[in-house]
């Protein structure tokens, strides 16, 4: 059994999250994850989910009674989601920490916008994808 | 030329983001994007970047002088990053809107944690990936 299971059960007790009523009004994440089978689509969604959990854990960093549980789960997230790659985790953390109200960050973000946009479509690797990408480009209305 | 280019140039003027000094102290996003070539890794990072831009645009939604530019860029992000798939965009938006301080949201998140964690690793599709997954399990320190 993965180590996070026992610690997640511990967090359930702490947050009083084991009761059946918690599931009322639908799920937060599980229903959304069920919608997406493609790996790249799943990563788009999981990226937001993981950043949510890291934010949540940060809010409880001073609560000693759950520190071991939180640390174990974070470590397991690093293994599973970031494939134990510290650089990947660090880059991710940088992105989640940028303040949207910081004027310098705003200016940089707008400065980089054109290049970021140019990279948003998936790289045309497979024959199928290349074809659909080319169709897209062909379909662009001329400005 | 893609429609966002002209509008992004307009935003550069508005944010005074065209000057060379904006690039001082490195980039926000471009350097990070250069680090990741794998499509799934790129999606992890781009997910955070796109949510940053949507938050930024939301902060300026009442500024009429840049509304057309913002709407055109958002539309192009919807086309490029979400592949014109409204459900993908809606699921993404739900995830970005969850409040980490809402007690009910916290309880639900902890309630779903074990299942979310179980799905974090990419499905072991290729031989190489399967092998590295097994190596990982072998390297696990016993708890």
């Amino acid at each position: 059994q993965d180590p996070y299971v026992k610690e997640a059960e511990n967090l359930k007790k702490y947050f009083n999250a084991g009761h059946s009523d918690v599931a009322d009004n639908g799920t937060l994440f599980l229903g959304i994850l069920k919608n997406w089978k493609e790996e790249s689509d799943r990563k788009i969604m999981q990226s937001q989910i993981v950043s949510f959990y890291f934010k949540l854990f940060k809010n409880f960093k001073d609560d000693q009674s759950i520190q071991k549980s939180v640390e174990t789960i974070k470590e397991d997230m690093n293994v599973k989601f970031f494939n134990s790659n510290k650089k990947k985790r660090d880059d991710f953390e940088k992105l989640t920490n940028y303040s949207v109200t910081d004027l310098n960050v705003q200016r940089k973000a707008i400065h980089e916008l054109i290049q970021v946009m140019a990279e948003l479509s998936p790289a045309a690797k497979t024959g199928k994808r290349k074809r659909s990408q080319m169709l897209f480009r062909g379909r662009r209305a001329s400005q | 030329q893609d429609p966002y280019v002209k509008e992004a140039e307009n935003l550069k003027k508005y944010f005074n983001a065209g000057h060379s000094d904006v690039a001082d102290n490195g980039t926000l996003f471009l350097g990070i994007l250069k680090n990741w070539k794998e499509e799934s890794d790129r999606k992890i990072m781009q997910s955070q970047i796109v949510s940053f831009y949507f938050k930024l645009f939301k902060n300026f939604k009442d500024d009429q002088s840049i509304q057309k530019s913002v709407e055109t860029i958002k539309e192009d992000m919807n086309v490029k990053f979400f592949n014109s798939n409204k459900k993908k965009r809606d699921d993404f938006e739900k995830l970005t809107n969850y409040s980490v301080t809402d007690l009910n949201v916290q309880r639900k998140a902890i309630h779903e944690l074990i299942q979310v964690m179980a799905e974090l690793s990419p499905a072991a599709k290729t031989g190489k990936r399967k092998r590295s997954q097994m190596l990982f399990r072998g390297r696990r320190a016993s708890q």
Partner: antibody
């Protein structure tokens, strides 16, 4: 109330051209992608083309690619479909349709339709 | 190419409940919204369900939409059937570059 009114249909010879227009009202036109859908006599619905809210992205069914051109004039709240090199199999009622999003998305409102007949 | 398959026709008596299915040929039907359109003879289509299960204003709650991931299908259910429900019904989704329609189902109210 959302209203979509198509004009410009009629009888045309094979190889000829026709331009359909769709006048839209009752919503912020530039905020929504628009679509053309057709229905051949006695047949089902077939999607033809779509265009994003700004007009920056366009989409075509394989059956019309290279022959039809979709465009929009957001200042006039009007959608167009330029149909060239028309064939007998293009004979259909053409519906203008509004989608619920700027980049595509579900169709939520339909026009009354306009008959295009391609025949010699 | 992604396709949506519907039964050619269904029939049921007034007051009863009928379900029309729409099955995706590939991928996951849940990865895109499914819409349902009603077309009465000689009229333009109207939307009865959009975004899987949402009803436009003016459409009665007798109409409901659902998604079944296990069978990769969407369903339109009409309860308390009325004679005015007799029409063709089309499902529709999107496959990344095209809007795809099902072949249509003729509903007869007996």
């Amino acid at each position: 109330d959302v209203q979509l009114v198509e004009t410009g249909g009629g009888l045309v010879q094979p190889g000829g051209s026709l331009r359909l227009s769709c006048a839209a009202s009752g919503f912020t036109f530039s905020s929504y992608a628009m679509s053309w859908v057709r229905q051949a006599p006695g047949k089902g619905l077939e999607w033809v083309s779509a265009i994003s809210g700004s007009g920056g992205s366009t989409y075509y069914a394989d059956s019309v690619k290279g022959r039809f051109t979709i465009s929009r004039d957001n200042s006039k709240n009007t959608l167009y479909l330029q149909m060239d090199s028309l064939r007998a199999e293009d004979t259909a009622v053409y519906y203008c349709a509004k989608t619920s999003w700027n980049a595509g998305g579900p169709i939520d409102y339909w026009g009354q339709g306009n008959l295009v007949t391609v025949s010699s | 190419n992604f396709m949506l398959t519907q039964p050619h026709s269904v029939s049921e008596s007034p007051g009863k409940t009928v379900t029309i299915s729409c099955t995706g040929s590939s991928g996951s039907i849940a990865s895109n919204y499914v819409q349902w359109y009603q077309q009465r003879p000689g009229s333009a289509p109207t939307t009865v369900i959009y975004e899987d299960n949402q009803r436009p204003s003016g459409v009665p709650p007798r109409f409901s939409g659902s998604i079944d991931r296990s069978s990769n299908s969407a369903s339109l259910t009409i309860s308390g059937l009325k004679s005015e429900d007799e029409a063709d019904y089309y499902c529709q989704s999107y496959d990344g570059s095209a809007w795809v329609f099902g072949g249509g189902t003729k509903l007869t109210v007996l």
